[in-house]
C-alpha cells in the first residue's frame, strides 16, 4: 500500500493484485515522482483506505475515466510529483 | 534522478530511414509508457505516438502510422524511434518523454534530425 | 481527435505582471490537461499536470484552473526567468494533442 518514505513523498511498492469495484472507489491520485520506484494511481475507497494499484491495467484506467467524468473525484494535494 | 539521454543530432539523406534512440536511466521503462513527440523548427509540439515496453504494444497518431515505428529494448533499458521514407517535412527535433498518464513529465533533451536533398 | 486551441499565439507582457494564458478544447477533456514551459533550445517542462496540481519544484505564483473544455495557466508576478512558451496538453484522449503555443516576450 500506500508509504510515505520522507514527507511529503509518497511512493507504491505494492499494488493491489484484484480489480476493486468502482462504486468502492471515491477519489484517486497519481503518484509520478522520480523518488519512487513507480509511477502509480492511489484510490481511497468510501471506507477512507487507501490503495495502489497499477495505472497501465485496463480496470484502473476505467476507474479513473468513470471517476473524472462523474465528478466524484476531488483535487487531492498531489504528495509526490516529478 | 530520472535522465532520458539522445543524441544531439543526426543528418540523413531524404528516401532514407533513420533510428533514434533514447537510453532511460533512473527508472524501469517497464513500469512505464515511451513517448515520441516532434517539433518542426519555430512550430509547436506534436504527440507521435507511445510504446509500453512491458509488451510491445503500441498506440499512434493516426497521421504518424506508416512514418513512424516505435519499439523498446527491455535488456538495455532504451526505447526506439525508426523514421522511413524520410523528406524535408521529417525535419525536426524529436523528442523522447516517459508518462503512463498521458502527460509527460522527464523529457530527454532532443535529436535534432535533418534531412537532406 | 481533440483540438487544443490557445488564443494568443504571442503576448508583449511586462516584468511583474499578471499573465492568463487561456486553453480551449473541442469536447470536454475532464480536467486532463497539463501545461508546459519551454524556453529556446531546451525540451519542454511540465509544470502542471490535472489541470491545476503543481509539479514538485514549480514556482507558487504559477497556477492552473479550469474544467470541462476551457482551462487557464496564470502567473502572478512575471519574473525574467518565465518569458518562454506555454502549450496545454490534453491527455483524455489518444491522440495527445497540443495548443499551439503561446509566446512571452518582454516589451
Known amino acids: 500500500g500506500p508509504d510515505a518514505v520522507s514527507t511529503p513523498v509518497t511512493c507504491c511498492y505494492n499494488v493491489v493484485k484484484q480489480k476493486i469495484h468502482v462504486r468502492k472507489l471515491k477519489s484517486y491520485r497519481r503518484i509520478t515522482s522520480s523518488q519512487c520506484p513507480r509511477e502509480a494511481v492511489i484510490f481511497r475507497t468510501i471506507l477512507d483506505k487507501e490503495i495502489c494499484a497499477d495505472p497501465k491495467e485496463k480496470w484502473v484506467k476505467n476507474s479513473i475515466n468513470h471517476l473524472d467524468k462523474t465528478s466524484q473525484t476531488f483535487i487531492l494535494e498531489p504528495s509526490c510529483l516529478g | 534522478e530520472v535522465q532520458l539521454q539522445q543524441s544531439g543530432a543526426e543528418l540523413v539523406k531524404a528516401g532514407a530511414s533513420v533510428k533514434l534512440s533514447c537510453p532511460a536511466s533512473?527508472?524501469?521503462?517497464?513500469?512505464?509508457?515511451m513517448h515520441w513527440v516532434k517539433q518542426r523548427p519555430e512550430q509547436g509540439l506534436e504527440w507521435i505516438g507511445r510504446i509500453d515496453p512491458a509488451n510491445g504494444n503500441t498506440k499512434f497518431d493516426p497521421k504518424f502510422q506508416g512514418k513512424a515505428t516505435i519499439t523498446a529494448d527491455t535488456s538495455s533499458n532504451t526505447a526506439y524511434l525508426q523514421l522511413s521514407s524520410l523528406t524535408s517535412e521529417d525535419t525536426a527535433v524529436y523528442y523522447c518523454?516517459?508518462?503512463?498518464?498521458?502527460?509527460?513529465?522527464?523529457w530527454g533533451q532532443g535529436t535534432t534530425l535533418t534531412v537532406s536533398s | 481527435d481533440i483540438q487544443m486551441t490557445q488564443s494568443s499565439s504571442s503576448f508583449s507582457v511586462s516584468l511583474g505582471d499578471r499573465v492568463t494564458i487561456t486553453c480551449k478544447a473541442t469536447e470536454d477533456i475532464y480536467n486532463r490537461l497539463a501545461w508546459y514551459q519551454q524556453k529556446p533550445g531546451s525540451a519542454p517542462r511540465l509544470l502542471i499536470s490535472g489541470a491545476t496540481s503543481l509539479e514538485t519544484g514549480v514556482p507558487s505564483r504559477f497556477s492552473g484552473s479550469g474544467s470541462g473544455k476551457d482551462y487557464t495557466l496564470s502567473i502572478t508576478s512575471l519574473q525574467t526567468e518565465d518569458v518562454a512558451t506555454y502549450y496545454c496538453?490534453?491527455?483524455?484522449?489518444?491522440?495527445?494533442?497540443f495548443g499551439g503555443g503561446t509566446k512571452l516576450e518582454i516589451k
Open positions: 496538453q490534453q491527455f483524455w484522449s489518444a491522440p495527445y494533442t
Open positions: 518523454a516517459r508518462g503512463v498518464f498521458g502527460f509527460f513529465d522527464y
Open positions: 533512473g527508472l524501469n521503462i517497464k513500469d512505464t509508457y
